[in-house]
Amino acid sequence: FERTRSLQDPCSNCPAGTFCDNNRNQICSPCPPNSFSSAGGQRTCDICRQCKGVFRTRKECSSTSNAECDCTPGFHCLGAGCSMCEQDCKQGQELTKKGCKDCCFGTFNDQKRGICRPWTNCSLDGKSVLVNGTKERDVVCGPSPADLSPGASSVTPPAPAREPGHSPQ
């Protein structure tokens, strides 16, 4: 039945980029400017998306495909097909419902999006703080306090990184 119907329906022959024009005896007419049809057999063309304001054009609309938008600098995409633009914050900040806020003491964010995360607690791994944390950077953990006993060099390189769950040899 599906095959029969397609044989009888002249619109099924209209390719992408055209529409089946009922006003012109179901002739396949090209999509008007600023519209598209991405599949064959369509009776109307869809209006092209316009990337305005904070949205900028990533891909121009063609007769067979819609325009694609992304966000201008200072914003990043959210939602399917970049339906929304959310503002970036500076490093050392997080985006809240009321805008960008500085990271609280003891937390950091090294990116322009996302939330502030707590500094690493070096003592949990038996290490000491080598470099203090900031709003933009995590602390750097150094050797354990025992390794820094009098007479020991304070510039010894930290032990090689080991996988979690593995004990030192």
Epitope: T96, K97, K98
Partner: nanobody, 124 residues
Framework: EVQLLESGGGLVQPGGSLRLSCAAS????????MTWVRQPPGKGLEWVSS????????YYADSVKGRFTISRDNSKNTLYLQMNSLRAEDTAVYYC?????????????????WGQGTTVTVSS
């Protein structure tokens, strides 16, 4: 599949009112806080209001406080935004969003699902 479908947008004169609705499906609605955000033309997202899963706690952006009211009907799986005394600066696409937990605040977004949006135009 989790879905949020907004409705109720349109053209309204300054000083007028509109009521937006958001029909939710695909999850236990009463277990999650919900949020309205908006995107004015040419600008970024702006948080409008949030409500806890039970409806007992509500939060508003300063720009809409006293004019907008968020509410929910958990028996109908629907979120509402009553907008009164509308101003030209309220013109935007309004999005309904599901938060990741039942509680909410005026701080973190914590949004994991967005609707498609409904357009509100305030103009004389």
């Amino acid at each position: 599949e989790v879905q949020l479908l907004e409705s109720g947008g349109g053209l309204v004169q300054p000083g007028g009112s509109l009521r937006l609705s958001c029909a939710a499906s695909g999850f236990t609605f009463s277990n999650y806080a919900m949020t309205w955000v908006r995107q004015p033309p040419g600008k970024g997202l702006e948080w409008v209001s949030s409500i806890s899963g039970s409806g007992g706690s509500t939060y508003y952006a300063d720009s809409v406080k006293g004019r907008f009211t968020i509410s929910r009907d958990n028996s109908k799986n629907t979120l509402y935004l009553q907008m009164n005394s509308l101003r030209a600066e309220d013109t935007a696409v309004y999005y309904c969003a599901k938060e990741g937990t039942g509680t909410t605040s005026d701080y973190y977004y914590n949004v994991d699902v967005w609707g498609q949006g409904t357009t509100v135009t305030v103009s004389s």
